[in-house]
């Protein structure tokens, strides 16, 4: 009889230990959840406040109307320039008008002087047509001034106030473009 009672007591004690452990685990889990919630809320508030205070363009980008422009500080071939822009959520510059061309060339003059900058223009190897990266044709006043004699792929670049063409494998600076964020305030 005594043996039976002590066995039951031991089982109860074991149960109690397990319940304490479970309670401890639950308390830990709750604390961890609370911390995660705090982190989540802080992250959300941060995101919201930075979105609220954000300027239409990222740091080191230039704004003109609905567009943001990034003028690179490194040289690369045309294809790598294209990928560098994509990494920033942008594409190589697509010049839509003379006004945009004037803004770009004016800005470049202020920033860096007379260097070569890749834009998102390339010449189709078969037809010889110039096309922007999205497949659209440049307006007649925005065609590269000289036809490159290169047998390789030919791409467009800006220098001073001109749009010129060159072998896509040459190294130049580049200009990326993305839409400016609309202010909701």
């Amino acid at each position: 009889k005594l043996l039976q009672v002590s066995t039951i007591a031991m089982q109860q004690q074991e149960k109690l230990i397990q319940q304490e452990r479970a309670l401890l685990n639950f308390t830990e889990w709750k604390r961890s959840c609370a911390l995660q919630m705090k982190y989540c809320q802080a992250f959300m508030q941060n995101s919201l406040s930075s979105a609220h205070n954000s300027s239409p363009c990222p740091n080191n980008w230039i704004q003109n109307r609905e567009s943001c422009y990034y003028v690179s500080e490194i040289w690369s071939i045309w294809h790598t320039s294209q990928e560098n822009c994509l990494k920033e959520g942008s594409t190589l510059l697509q010049i839509e008008s003379k006004e945009e061309m004037d803004f770009i060339t004016g800005s470049l003059r202020k920033i860096k002087g007379s260097y070569d900058y890749w834009v998102g223009l390339s010449q189709d190897g078969h037809s010889g047509r110039w096309l922007w990266q999205d497949g659209s044709s440049p307006s007649p006043g925005l065609l590269p001034a000289e036809r490159s004699q290169s047998a390789n792929q030919v791409c467009g670049y800006v220098k001073s106030n001109s749009l010129l063409s060159s072998n896509c494998s040459t190294w130049k600076y580049f200009i990326c473009e993305k839409y400016a964020l609309r202010s909701s305030v």
């Epitope: 990928e83 994509l86 990494k87 959520g89 594409t91 497949g135 993305k178 839409y179």
Partner: nanobody, 115 residues
Framework: QVQLQESGGGLVQPGGSLRLSCAAS????????MGWYRQAPGKQRELVAA???????TYADSVKGRFTISRDNAGNTVYLQMNSLRPEDTAVYYC?????????WGQGTQVTVSS
């Protein structure tokens, strides 16, 4: 990490169409653009088309007017609609996620254009 899963490849006749899909999961908030590359046997991997998270597309000269890249509204899935396919479009097509840091690649899907 960003995980990418491609689908939609297959065998198609010249002049036919295919639609490739690439579904992204994981840390997709870090992705600034997504694109499709292709690699034919013995050739280098080349960018076919890409689309930024603002929806701006970019295409290789060889596919302009034939291929169209698009995204779903959530931005998690990117599609490549390929029309007027040619034998020279035969390749393994890879999806790529562009971030400021690492770039992430899918496993690839085979596209074969043959009669």
């Amino acid at each position: 990490q960003v995980q990418l899963q491609e689908s939609g490849g297959g065998l198609v006749q010249p002049g036919g169409s295919l639609r490739l899909s690439c579904a992204a999961s994981g840390r997709i908030f870090s992705v600034n653009a997504m694109g499709w590359y292709r690699q034919a046997p013995g050739k280098q991997r080349e960018l076919v088309a890409a689309i930024t998270n603002q929806g701006a597309p970019t295409y290789a000269d060889s596919v302009k007017g034939r291929f169209t890249i698009s995204r779903d509204n959530a931005g998690n899935t990117v599609y490549l609609q390929m029309n007027s396919l040619r034998p020279e479009d035969t390749a393994v097509y890879y999806c790529k996620a562009f971030t400021r840091g690492d770039d992430y690649w899918g496993q690839g899907t085979q596209v074969t254009v043959s009669s």
